[in-house]
């Protein structure tokens, strides 16, 4: 129902906690440079200023709309041309078109420092002194290194954050609690930032209609046991939801999710049986229970499909009457009985479904021509099977650092013009697939391993556009979000690349590189690697892993020497001597 | 062509165990449902346990906690570990499979159980 002031709606609807985190994070996503404090004067100002609209709503700019309001904030900053440049031009627009500028000018890759981790004792004494603050800064570094991050989803890991801390920093050794349970909250926060990209990028490319399809894909998995009706109106409000959030709406969103965790827990019976223990938690911890519920039991007895969708005398009929209706129960009838196939690899096959009714329904014997559908989705379905088996038999050999270096060493030979910065993140995030799904069941391993490599992939995109280089990126990221993967998988060595010259300094390491953790030793070793390929694009894996190896014993010696810096500075040539003559 | 293996039947005396196995080939697909049925002579085939894609199970009342179906999913293969062995249990024991496209019906393996 319309309230007369929306402000005081959500404030009501959320509690001040939320609300504060929510707005906080709308604004370190919007901009992305402002310090804290700067935000966290303004969440407070909109927030005194919601709580006058809450005491009275007809009381002067209540009424105005939440962009209404946020932007006018965001515009009143000062020095925004300054720090924002072009930025600052959209506050010359008026709502809808302001809140569309300041999205298109969320930066995907902020030039940020990477977001440092406090020592424990210093992380526990600001922690201590002040909470609210504590946690007010991690949704702020978080949320303007990721603008796209799920807002409901930054408070569940600000209160997983939150609840660490409390026990940690309780304890005699503070660092051992705090390191692996912080890296674990790290670990899962980074997947669920490029998942949301994920679908974020859905939405604004392909429309709602593209995210609800992956929605019922997704829902009927998760609940094979729900009717048709049933899956179609929880796609629909998650849908809803992921739009609201993607596009900056985020107290909306946070609102609408808690009524659909809300809806599902009072639907059970006709969901799913998993529920409950999801149900029980409160809020944050129940929503997102409930985004990542296990599968509820298949029906024991579901028929095959091929009756309705390909035997069936009037399955054009049914299709011309409403295709999407059709399409989608299509869709909803495949994806439940088939828990083990990616998301993306059923769009994949709804979508050549579709296509096939679309040329048969228009022919003069239909039936015949659509006859062998099913069949035709056997180079679709191997595909996968294959990348995850081949894959996944390559992780178990090399490990997940060997595993990295192999994806290192094949994407700079797909696309060598992207900056190895951007090569090395990608290879070392597309080779954590390794030690995410390989160690699953195997029905568990195909939707584990593709959708997270779309995820990556879609981020790779997201980089590469800002900046295009290569056609061969270019050509796999504009075509369907759902091919992106197989396209990738399909490049080969770049023909087109002329090789980098060889230059001795990009090879030339010092003793500092000895004290560096191992993760940032690795990405040393990783861009040097990138760096070869770019030298050699048609270097042979053995020609590469004897220079890998001499690089790496190299690294030892010195890394051991008494004299480090000698070592580095009489050793450091010869090894860029052997490394010429080993690709030579 | 989708071609079924059965393999594992035999004579066993009552108390025994056997274990059936039904190895599918020549499909595209996974199968989402994986079963045996059986049937005695001059009785009606009957469902005696089904695996589906997510490893649910069910069984037929008369062999629960004697009876354990289970797959390999990367083999496409189906197993039946029959433990317990009762006269009545002697049937012909037939392996079923299901994908998108349609089921598929094994020969049938013949399973005795006498002292």
């Known amino acids: 129902e319309a309230h007369k002031s929306e402000i005081a709606h959500r404030y009501n609807d959320l509690g001040e906690q939320h609300f504060k985190g929510l707005v906080l994070i709308a604004f370190s996503q919007y901009l992305q440079k402002c310090s804290y404090d700067e935000h966290a004067k303004l969440v407070q100002e909109v927030t005194d200023f919601a709580k006058t609209c809450v005491a009275d709503e007809s009381a002067a700019n209540c009424d105005k709309s939440l962009h209404t309001l946020f932007g006018d904030k965001l515009c009143a900053i000062p020095n925004l041309r300054e720090n924002y440049g072009e930025l600052a031009d959209c506050c010359t627009k008026q709502e809808p078109e302001r809140n569309e500028c300041f999205l298109q000018h969320k930066d995907d890759n902020p030039s940020l420092p990477p977001f440092e981790r406090p020592e424990a004792e210093a992380m526990c004494t600001s922690f201590k002194e002040n909470p609210t603050t504590f946690m007010g800064h991690y949704l702020h570094e978080v949320a303007r290194r990721h603008p796209y991050f799920y807002a409901p989803e930054l408070l569940y890991y600000a209160e997983q954050y939150n609840e660490i801390l409390t026990q940690c920093c309780a304890e005699a050794d503070k660092e051992s609690c705090l390191t692996p349970k912080l890296d674990g909250v790290k670990e899962k926060a980074l997947v669920s930032s490029v998942r949301q990209r994920m679908k974020c990028s859905s939405m604004q490319k392909f429309g709602e209609r593209a995210f609800k399809a992956w929605a019922v894909a997704r829902l009927s998995q998760t609940f094979p046991n729900a009717d048709f009706a049933e899956i179609t109106k929880l796609a629909t409000d998650l849908t809803k939801v992921n739009k609201e959030c993607c596009h900056g709406d985020l107290l909306e969103c946070a609102d609408d999710r808690a009524e659909l965790a809300k809806y599902m827990c009072e639907n059970q019976a006709t969901i799913s049986s998993k529920l409950q223990t999801c149900c029980d938690k409160p809020l944050l911890k129940k929503a997102h229970c409930l985004s990542e519920v296990e599968h509820d039991t298949m029906p024991a007895d579901l028929p095959a499909i091929a009756a309705d969708f390909v035997e069936d005398q009037e399955v054009c009929k049914n299709y011309a009457e409403a295709k999407d209706v059709f399409l989608g129960t299509f869709l909803y009838e495949y994806s439940r009985r088939h828990p083990d196939y990616s998301v993306s690899l059923l769009l994949r096959l709804a979508k050549k479904y579709e296509a096939t009714l679309e040329k048969c329904c228009a022919e003069a014997n239909p039936p015949a021509c659509y006859g062998t559908v099913l069949a035709e989705f056997q180079p679709l379905v191997e595909e996968p099977k294959n990348l995850v088996k081949t894959n996944c038999d390559l992780y178990e050999k090399l490990g997940e650092y060997g595993f990295q270096n192999a994806i290192l060493v094949r994407y700079t030979q797909k696309a060598p013009q992207v900056s190895t910065p951007t090569l090395v993140e990608a290879a070392r995030n597309l080779g954590r697939v390794g030690t995410k799904c390989c160690t699953l069941p195997e029905d568990q391993r195909l939707p584990c391993v593709e959708d997270y490599l779309s995820a990556i992939l879609n981020r790779v995109c997201l980089l590469h556009e800002k900046t295009p280089v290569s056609e061969h990126v270019t050509k796999c990221c504009s075509g369907s979000l759902v091919e992106r993967r197989p396209c990738f998988s399909a490049l080969t060595v770049d023909e087109t690349y002329v090789p980098k010259e060889f230059k001795a300094e990009t090879f030339t390491f010092h003793s500092d590189i000895c004290t560096l953790p191992e993760k940032e030793k690795q990405i040393k070793k990783q861009t040097a690697l990138a760096e070869l390929v770019k030298h050699k694009p048609k270097a042979t894996a053995e020609q590469l892993k004897t220079v890998m190896d001499d690089f790496a014993q190299f690294l030892d010696t010195c890394c051991k020497a008494a004299d480090k810096d000698t070592c580095f500075s009489t050793e450091g040539p010869n090894l860029v001597t052997r490394c010429k003559d080993a690709l030579a | 062509q989708v071609q079924l293996q059965e393999s594992g039947g035999g004579l066993v005396q009552p108390g025994g165990s056997l274990r059936l196995s039904c190895a599918a080939s020549?499909?595209?697909?996974?199968?989402?449902?994986m079963a045996w049925y059986r049937r005695a002579p001059g009785k009606e085939r009957e469902l005696v346990a089904l695996?589906?894609?997510?490893?649910?199970?069910n069984y037929a009342d008369s062999v629960k906690g004697r009876f354990t179906i289970s797959r390999d999913y990367a083999k496409n293969t189906v197993y039946l570990q029959m433990d317990s062995l009762k006269p009545e249990d002697t049937a012909a024991y037939y392996c079923?499979?299901?994908?998108?496209?349609?089921?598929?019906w094994g020969q049938g393996t013949q399973v005795t159980v006498s002292s």
């Open positions: 079923n499979v299901r994908n998108v496209e349609r089921d598929y």
């Open positions: 020549g499909s595209i697909f996974t199968f989402y449902r």
């Open positions: 695996i589906t894609t997510d490893t649910s199970t």
